[in-house]
């Protein structure tokens, strides 16, 4: 089952500005840009063995996340 | 996603090496394509990137001498490096990371640059 | 920059032994509840393959074998059972701001 985007809030860093539901917070430059500029994932297929922890970084709301949290969707944005 | 570098083995001292990656199944308008370098038997070293909106990053130790330019319609990009002396020799590769992580995923086979006269 | 210190330089090893190599860096790496840190996997005449990002996150095709682990500033890139085709040599990376930074490599050899 495909999610959308969950969001990523700092431990050690203040929230970026909060992006839309279109937008991915791109850390490079640190503001939000449309999602399909970055190289966002895609589905793995059924079976893959390995966890596909990807998800769209966009810290409008604080979800808790652990470092590279093994549950975390894959973006619903591609 | 497959990315395939090209460009001449041998550079002369003082010239400009100039190398190519040719990127097939991404569109280089998304994502950030970078270059790393790897010396003969030593490690690697970031030298930069050129992001999906044409902005670019060069690593500070090498700014002064580093061009990392696109063509979209071939959907390659280039590294030109002026004035290199024999510390330049190295295996130059072309990369692009994950998102949100950032991670270089895919890579190409790299290229050898031999500098010397 | 951040600067990646690797240890070992380079070990020797059995097949199926467990090898764990580490990796510190010079400040934090860990941003918006990631840890930006990634291990390769580096052969002879080949370019770099992604073992793990995220700290502990398996790259694709990975074996299962192979996990990493950390925060912060230290990290560990564990082998469970060394396995011929484990002989290489492992970097760390972080890739939280640039320049992206290497450590200076981690070189298993068979013993």
């Known amino acids: 089952m495909r999610r959308g985007p969950r969001s990523l809030r700092g431990r050690d860093a203040p929230a970026p500005t909060p992006c839309v539901p279109a937008e991915c917070f791109d850390l490079l430059v640190r503001h939000c840009v449309a999602c399909g500029l970055l190289r966002t994932p895609r589905p793995k297929p059924a079976g893959a063995s390995s966890p596909a922890p990807r998800t769209a970084l966009q810290p409008q709301e604080s979800v808790g996340a652990g470092a590279g949290e093994a549950a975390l969707p894959l973006p619903g944005l591609l | 996603v497959q990315l395939q570098e090209s460009g001449p083995g041998l550079v002369k001292p003082s010239e400009t090496l100039s190398l190519t990656c040719s990127v097939s199944g991404d569109s280089i308008t998304s994502g950030y394509w970078n270059w790393i370098r790897q010396p003969p038997g030593k490690g690697l070293e970031y030298i930069g990137y050129?992001?999906?909106?044409?902005?670019?990053y060069y690593n500070p130790s090498l700014k002064s001498r580093v061009t990392i330019s696109r063509d979209t319609s071939k959907n390659q990009y280039s590294l030109r490096l002026s004035s290199v002396t024999a510390a330049d020799t190295a295996l130059y590769y072309c990369?692009?990371?994950?998102?949100?992580?950032?991670?270089?995923?895919?890579w190409g086979q790299g290229t050898r640059v031999t500098v010397s006269s | 920059d951040i600067v990646m210190t690797q240890s070992p330089s380079s070990l020797s090893a059995s097949v199926g032994d467990r090898v764990t190599i580490t990796c510190r860096a010079s400040e934090s790496v860990d941003n918006y509840g990631i840890s930006f840190m990634n291990w390769f996997q580096q052969k002879p005449g080949k370019a770099p393959k992604l073992l793990i990002y995220?700290?502990?996150n398996l790259g694709s095709g990975v074996p299962s074998r192979f996990s990493g682990s950390g925060s912060g500033t230290d990290f560990t890139l564990t082998i469970s059972s060394l396995q011929p085709e484990d002989f290489a040599t492992y970097y760390c990376?972080?890739?939280?701001?640039?320049?992206?930074?290497f450590g200076q490599g981690t070189k298993v050899e068979i013993k």
């Open positions: 050129i992001s999906y909106s044409g902005s670019t």
């Open positions: 990369a692009s990371p994950n998102y949100p992580f950032y991670a270089m995923d895919y």
């Open positions: 990376q972080q890739s939280k701001e640039v320049p992206w930074t």
């Open positions: 995220a700290a502990s």
